[in-house]
């Protein structure tokens, strides 16, 4: 009688993560008597995957009924496949022996490859805000995919970016891989509504790439421009001075009025108006009683924006001249800022 052969007809099997892998194996003879076992890998460090008679293998089922009298089909199914299951599987026939059964013949092996989807890309920006014209870095990470081949692209408002560096780890063979990419983005004053998108394409995604986004509103700081103007007289001896704070982002802003260097009033921006580009405008005004002053008054609008060093703009109010002849007559909307009389 011809010596028993162990046949594994499939050189390789490709399975998607989460699915069931079928590993086929048949023997050509019932002799010698002894169990079939399945291993992943070869040599002394091999991992036992299934033993016909003992062991605990909750993920493994047999394709045919191994208990049937002349059964020679030793194929198995492994459920809920993960990338960690990738490797070469051997169907091995043992001959009963003492004290232990003896390996008699092995199949040629079946390589199990696992296709696993990448995780949703996570995009993170710089820890601190930056101002327009500065270059900031964004990182994108995705994990757990297999095989290693993957494509990553960066976009800003739909326009593809070119200044980025990408690494796929590890470099050598692994059950699954991770991708890490860093893109450099130059900020503009119009970027409050902008988005940076990281797009990952992989064979498991069937042409429907995964995207991760970051809003530049989390990253950008647009410093305000200040303009101090003197408004028409409201009453004899009273002058209205306004401070226009324009095009700032984020909203966190504190304004202080100074008279000749002394703090007159401090307020926090509340009822702001939003511009189309996402930046904000705000106006504060001060009512000055000129008759209370003998000398000229230097009025300063000092603004601290988003915790940054204060910026200021000053306006000289000449007491000697008649109020009606002074300053600009530009009409300004009264935003309801608190009145402040100087006596």
């Amino acid at each position: 009688e011809e010596e028993l052969q162990v046949i594994q007809p499939d050189k390789s099997v490709l399975v998607a993560a989460g699915e069931t892998a079928t590993l086929r194996c048949t023997a050509t003879s019932l002799i010698p008597v002894g169990p079939i076992q399945w291993f992943r890998g070869a040599g002394p460090g091999r991992e036992l995957i299934y033993n016909q008679k003992e062991g605990h293998f909750p993920r493994v089922t047999t394709v045919s009924d191994l208990t049937k009298r002349n059964n020679m089909d030793f194929s198995i199914r492994i459920g809920n496949i993960t990338p960690a299951d990738a490797g070469t599987y051997y169907c091995v026939k043992f001959r009963k022996g003492s004290p232990d059964d003896v390996e008699f013949k092995s199949g040629a092996g079946t390589e199990l490859s696992v296709r696993a989807k990448p995780s949703a890309p996570v995009v993170s920006g710089p820890a601190a805000r930056a101002t327009p014209q500065h270059t900031v870095s964004f990182t994108c990470e995705s994990h757990g995919f297999s095989p290693r081949d993957i494509t990553l692209k960066w976009f800003k408002n739909g326009n593809e970016l070119s200044d980025f560096q990408t690494n796929v780890d590890p470099v050598g063979e692994s059950v699954s891989y991770s991708i890490h990419s860093t893109a450099k983005v130059v900020l503009t004053r119009e970027d409050v509504h902008s988005q940076v998108i990281c797009e990952v394409a992989h064979v498991t995604l069937q042409g429907d790439p995964l995207r991760g986004t970051a809003n530049l509103s989390e990253t950008i700081r647009v410093p305000p421009t200040l303009e101090v103007t003197q408004q028409p007289v409201r009453a004899e001896n009273q002058v209205n001075v306004t401070c226009q704070v324009r095009k700032f982002y984020p909203q966190r802003l504190q304004l202080t009025w100074l008279e000749n260097g002394n703090v007159s009033r401090t307020e926090t921006a509340s009822t702001v108006t939003e511009n189309k580009d996402g930046t904000y405008n705000w106006m504060s005004w001060l009512l000055v009683n000129v008759s209370a002053h003998r000398d000229d008054v230097k009025l300063t609008c000092q603004v601290e924006h988003d915790g940054q060093p204060a910026v200021s703009k000053s306006h000289d109010l000449k007491v000697s001249a008649h109020p009606k002849e002074q300053g600009s007559n530009t009409a300004a909307e009264n935003t309801g800022s608190n009145e402040r009389n100087i006596y």
Epitope: G45, E47, N51, K53, E54, G55, F57, T67, K96, D100
Partner: antibody, heavy 114, light 108 residues
Framework: EVQLQQSGAELVKPGASVKLSCTAS????????IHWVKQRTEQGLEWIGR????????KYAPKFQGKATITADTSSNTAYLQLNSLTSEDTAVYSC???????WGQGTLVTVSA | QIVLTQSPAIMSASPGEKVTLTCSAS???????LYWYQQKPGSSPKLWIY???NLASGVPARFSGSGSGTSYSLTISSMEAEDAASYFC?????????FGGGTKLEIK
């Protein structure tokens, strides 16, 4: 549902023999090895041996060679452990387990006493 | 035969404490064949960890197993009262199969 039902407690005299049974339900014993394990009060587990009920092949720990005999009857889906020449050292709980040790019988207490 | 030595033989731990039980083999054991069992008084042993690091069905995730060659361990990340029991390691890599002497784990 897999279950292993063991026979009841035994009180035996020194020098005598005893035969314990382990009846399986929820699986066919022909398909798996059946192991026997000894546990003395407040002590560890000792593997006695196992049988392949399909062909009757047995393996024993050296310590139990000659002391224990494991047999099986596939028609009744039952495995047996026979202990002979009993001494006080054999007083213990004896448990059967399905190959893989995921399922155990409830144990049988054997007390050897004059 | 392969002798499995467990340490400590007895130990107590406070709730929330991290606990590590060790099992040392006199010669190398393939990790596929190293199992752990939990046993409570009056009950049969329960399969707790199989193939060194896989938790049996129903075993809480605070348990983990690791090791290779001659050195294996069972770890409880945060001890709970219900974990008080005896734990036995077991090898079925080669005949005769053997069990460790056990570690009795008590709650403080």
């Amino acid at each position: 549902e897999v279950q292993l039902q063991q026979s009841g407690a035994e009180l035996v005299k020194p020098g005598a023999s005893v035969k314990l049974s382990c009846t399986a339900s929820g699986f066919n014993i022909k398909d798996y090895y059946i192991h026997w394990v000894k546990q003395r009060t407040e002590q560890g587990l000792e593997w006695i041996g196992r049988i392949d009920p399909e062909d009757g092949e047995t393996k024993y720990a050296p310590k139990f060679q000659g002391k224990a005999t494991i047999t099986a009857d596939t028609s009744s889906n039952t495995a047996y452990l026979q202990l002979n020449s009993l001494t006080s050292e054999d007083t213990a709980v004896y448990s059967c387990a399905k190959g893989g040790f995921a399922y155990w019988g409830q144990g049988t207490l054997v007390t050897v006493s004059a | 035969q392969i002798v499995l030595t467990q340490s400590p033989a007895i130990m107590s731990a406070s709730p929330g404490e991290k606990v590590t039980l060790t099992c040392s083999a006199s010669s190398s054991v393939s990790s596929s064949y190293l199992y752990w069992y939990q046993q409570k008084p009056g009950s049969s042993p329960k399969l707790w960890i199989y193939s060194t690091s896989n938790l049996a069905s129903g075993v809480p995730a605070r348990f983990s197993g690791s090791g290779s060659g001659t050195s294996y361990s069972l770890t409880i990340s945060s001890m709970e009262a219900e974990d008080a029991a005896s734990y036995f390691c077991h090898q079925w890599s080669s005949h005769p199969y053997t069990f460790g002497g056990g570690t009795k784990l008590e709650i403080k």
